[in-house]
């Protein structure tokens, strides 16, 4: 039975040209996290594997940095980076947990962080 929940940074906004940290946290389970995949809509951005460490997709290497922790840092943001991001936690023995983050990249200098929210 899957008892865990993923807490994410939720709906967030950031300035064009700036950086943002995408962060998810798995709680309420003793399951072992074996791998975390980060996806942007239909693109694989990066993978963090318990044994192999990080793999950043080559097409994102210039603008994506691993961490902190199991999170992901996006740099040199453009308006095209606006959209949904997913953290997919592969765990044993529970299975797969998915968290969603919506990022809005703003032209203006006013970029406020949204509230945290949970996905069961």
């Amino acid at each position: 039975m899957m008892t865990g929940t993923i807490e994410t940074t939720g709906n967030i906004s950031a300035e064009k040209g700036g950086s943002i940290i995408l962060q998810c946290h798995l709680s309420s389970t003793t399951a072992q996290v074996t791998q975390v995949n980060w996806e942007q809509q239909d693109q694989l951005l990066a993978i963090c594997n318990a044994d192999l460490g990080w793999h950043i997709s080559p097409s994102f290497k210039d603008r994506v940095a691993p961490g902190p922790g199991l999170g992901l840092t996006l740099q040199s943001l453009t308006v095209n980076d606006t959209g949904e991001y997913f953290c997919i936690y592969h765990t044993y023995p529970d299975g797969t947990y998915t968290g969603r983050i919506f990022l809005e990249v703003l032209e203006s200098s006013v970029a406020e962080h949204g509230a945290r929210f949970q996905i069961p």
């Epitope: 072992q32 074996t34 791998q35 996806e39 239909d42 693109q43 694989l44 993978i47 594997n49 318990a50 044994d51 192999l52 793999h55 997709s57 097409s59 592969h90 044993y92 023995p93």
Partner: antibody, heavy 118, light 107 residues
Framework: EVQLLESGGGLVQPGGSLRLSCAAS????????MNWVRQAPGKGLEWVAG????????YYADSVKGRFTISRDNSKNTLYLQMNSLRAEDTAVYYC???????????WGQGTLVTVSS | DIQMTQSPSSLSASVGDRVTITCRAS??????LNWYQQKPGKAPKLLIY???SLQSGVPSRFSGSGSGTDFTLTISSLQPEDFATYYC?????????FGGGTKVEIK
């Protein structure tokens, strides 16, 4: 240099058993998921089974479920495929392949031929 | 199970030609799509992983694109050593499945 070397293939009668081995070298075997993929004569590729690294979770194609068992011995850097109740349609070249991040298969062995015939 | 449909099943081309092979998944697989090349009597060789990432050591004339359900492998300028069979494969979910293959032959 990464190397995968399959062995254990041969001729076996229908209903018989065979155990394939894949000896790995040149990388930290225990850190990688591993797969068996087969190819019947003149046909395409068919994934048979996979085993993850951290969890050791095992996955099978429906066509072999209940008959084949994938396993690994990390101390011997070896992957196995135990094949029971073999059928004529299991005749194929069997490849072992390394599966980093369980997303792609980057290194393959040279294959071992299994022929099931009376 | 996710079905992978490759087209065409075979094609004839000349050295220097631009060749495009397509692969369609029966459901969305994000970018969990890989391309392999196989020559007769040899093991498959990884060309492209995660839809568009070029495997180390593979010539840059090979490229991959697509996401969701529709994917493409392109060889920008076909070389003599590229005549082979090409397979797509999804790793979105088990059972892992391959396309039926595309045989690239000399015209």
């Amino acid at each position: 240099e990464v190397q995968l070397l399959e062995s254990g293939g041969g001729l076996v009668q229908p209903g018989g058993s065979l155990r394939l081995s894949c000896a790995a070298s040149g990388f930290t075997f225990s850190s990688y998921g591993m797969n068996w993929v087969r190819q019947a004569p003149g046909k395409g590729l068919e994934w048979v089974a996979g085993i993850k690294s951290s969890s050791g979770n095992k996955y099978y194609a429906d066509s072999v479920k209940g008959r084949f068992t994938i396993s690994r011995d990390n101390s011997k850097n070896t992957l196995y495929l135990q094949m029971n109740s073999l059928r004529a349609e299991d005749t194929a070249v069997y490849y072992c392949a390394r599966g980093p991040y369980d997303v792609w298969m980057d290194y393959w062995g040279q294959g071992t031929l299994v022929t099931v015939s009376s | 199970d996710i079905q992978m449909t490759q087209s065409p099943s075979s094609l004839s081309a000349s050295v220097g030609d631009r060749v495009t092979i397509t692969c369609r998944a029966s459901q969305s697989i994000s970018s969990y799509l890989n391309w392999y090349q196989q020559k007769p009597g040899k093991a498959p060789k990884l060309l492209i992983y995660a839809a568009s990432s070029l495997q180390s050591g593979v010539p840059s004339r090979f490229s991959g694109s697509g996401s969701g359900t529709d994917f493409t492998l392109t060889i920008s300028s076909l070389q003599p050593e590229d005549f082979a069979t090409y397979y797509c494969q999804q790793s979105y979910s088990t059972p892992l499945t391959f396309g039926g293959g595309t045989k690239v032959e000399i015209k």
